[in-house]
């Protein structure tokens, strides 16, 4: 007769692993008992279990309530057992030793090996600015048995830098993900990957990137500066910009306080019907977190029955 | 015939030594673990000691651990008890039996049990 | 310590009567289980190993039953001979353990 075996049996941490020893004897031959064992290099063999054709399954103190035999209908020449909810500690090399009768004894060997799927985790690095040069994004860490396979998948053009940490049983696996920030990258997501023999599918942790930026400031609203005349009402300036985080928006006149009657509503300033002492120095003061940035106008409020029009100067200062 | 024949009882003070043996015969005697088992007056069975067939590993109860010391002369197919530090509690027949180490730590039932021999320990 | 509960300690029958005897270990020891007759200045017999198989030489009168934690010793016609004390013993851990004995007495 011969044992049959698995030369490796691969289980996923928690899971039950099925350690395979059948006898393909010839016909009247009996199986005894078959004792199991591990049998780790350089360690004496540590009793797992025995099953005996008369007294049953013998279970050694150290894997109590661990391991049993497959159930029901079992052949008497099967001397596979289970080993219950495996843990990282039980990869290694274990031994049937089938006492068989009239044939002898017979012994075979296998690898154990507890596939440890990683939790992956993903860090965003520091707060991104536009301005910055090569800037740590996110870095993602996984860590398993074997080691995993870490990704990134993104639109964003960077680069992408590993390394790789061995433990006793495992290996931690760190990349990070590095560019220069601009504000086309606002909102844009950066999706680490990682890989693993112990996962039936890829973990995907998205992290979505904000980059501080604040755009120059510009006023709408005299466009058409005949429309700026004594006695004309819903005239309006328009402060235009554009940040992240959104920016707030204060209004000032440069040549004294706000005309009494005109109302601050966020980036519009709206005037109550035009006077000439709504003539003046006005300024959009535009900030953020990440910056400030001011842009000024000259509003000038025609009289009709002056026949000459009046120039308009626009300046924008950061 | 497996046959087992203790000796070496008799009555002894509180503190005193005592070697029992148990003499082997009829069967391979280094092929088998040996355990001691006691009896005392008008009691139950109460295990005390066994040996692996090759001395490697002893076992105690409790009970006797650090005073009893088993051993056994597989050349001349004898079992031994030695007793120190007896004690009152200590009074029992003890007998000799014989299993079959399967695999590990793990013994067949003792199919084979000598006659006895009484121990008393008495002031 | 695996602990053997024997029930009932003792007993009173007839020749010919069926006997029961139980014995409940505090934890699974599959059938690593043995039963042992004695009888007064005499050294214990083993009637039955690994639960439920008789040793050789004992009569069939003699069964036994149960694995894990419930066993039973039967004796189904009682004879003269087989008025003695009965032990249950677990030889699944050691300590190996032993009942406390149950003792047949007639009737």
């Known amino acids: 007769g011969e044992l049959e075996t698995s030369d490796v049996v691969t289980v996923v941490l928690g899971q039950d692993a099925k350690l395979p020893c059948f006898y393909r004897g010839d016909s009247g031959e009996q199986v005894g008992q078959v004792a199991w064992a591990r049998v780790d290099a350089g360690e004496g063999a540590q009793e797992l279990a025995l099953l005996h054709s008369k007294y049953g399954l013998h279970v050694s103190p150290a894997y109590e309530g661990r391991v049993e035999q497959p159930p029901p209908p079992r052949n008497p020449l099967d001397g596979s057992v289970l080993l219950r909810n495996a843990v990282q500690a039980d990869e290694g090399e274990y031994e049937c030793r089938v006492s068989t009768f009239p044939a002898g004894s017979f012994q075979a060997r296998l690898r154990l090996r507890v596939l440890v799927p990683p939790l992956p985790s993903l860090n965003p690095g520091p707060a991104l600015e536009e301005g910055q040069g090569l800037t740590l994004a996110a870095s993602c860490t996984a860590e398993g048995s074997p080691a995993p396979s870490v990704t990134w998948d993104t639109e964003v053009k960077g680069t992408t830098s590993s390394r790789s940490f061995k433990h006793s049983r495992s290996a931690a696996v760190t990349s990070e993900f590095h560019l220069v920030p601009s504000r086309s990258m606002n909102g844009q997501p950066l999706t680490c990957v990682v890989s693993h023999p112990g996962l039936l599918q890829d973990q995907r942790i998205t992290h979505i990137l904000h980059v501080s930026f604040l755009a120059e400031a510009s006023v709408r609203g005299l466009e058409d500066q005949n429309l700026w005349h004594i006695g004309r009402e819903g005239a309006m300036l328009k402060c235009l910009s554009e940040g992240q985080p959104p920016p707030s928006y204060n209004w000032t006149r440069l040549d004294g306080p706000l005309p009494s009657g005109v109302r601050v509503d966020g980036d519009t300033l709206g005037f109550p019907p035009l006077t000439t002492e709504h003539s003046g120095i006005y300024v959009c003061h535009v900030s953020n977190e990440f910056s400030s940035r001011d842009s000024q106008v000259t509003v000038d409020v025609l009289d009709p029955q002056e026949d000459s029009g009046k120039q308009v100067d626009l300046v924008s200062a950061s | 015939e497996v046959q087992l024949v203790e000796s070496g009882g008799g009555l002894v003070q509180p503190g005193g030594s005592l070697r029992l043996s148990c003499a082997a015969s009829?069967?391979?005697?280094?092929?088998?673990?040996m355990s001691w088992v006691r009896q005392a007056p008008g009691k139950g069975l109460e295990w005390v000691s066994g040996i692996k067939p090759d001395s490697a590993t002893t076992y105690y109860a409790d009970s006797v651990k650090g005073r009893f010391t088993i051993s056994r002369d597989n050349s001349k197919n004898t079992l031994y008890l030695q007793m120190n530090s007896l004690r009152a509690e200590d009074t029992a027949v003890y007998y000799c039996a014989r299993a079959e180490l399967l695999a590990f730590d793990v013994y067949t039932a003792s199919d084979y049990w000598g006659q006895g021999t009484l121990v008393t320990v008495s002031s | 310590d695996i602990q053997m509960t024997q029930s009932p300690s003792s007993l009173s029958a007839s020749v010919g009567d069926r006997v029961t005897i139980t014995c409940r270990a505090s934890q699974g020891i599959s059938s690593y289980l043995a039963w042992y007759q004695q009888k007064p200045g005499k050294a214990p017999k083993l009637l039955i190993y690994?639960?439920?198989s008789l040793q050789s030489g004992v009569p069939s009168r003699f069964s036994g039953s149960g694995s894990g934690t419930d066993f039973t010793l039967t004796i189904s016609s009682l004879q003269p001979e087989d008025f003695a004390t009965y032990y249950c013993q677990q030889h699944y851990t050691t300590p190996p353990t032993f009942g406390q004995g149950t003792k047949v007495e007639i009737k």
């Open positions: 009829g069967y391979n005697f280094d092929n088998y673990a």
């Open positions: 690994a639960a439920s």
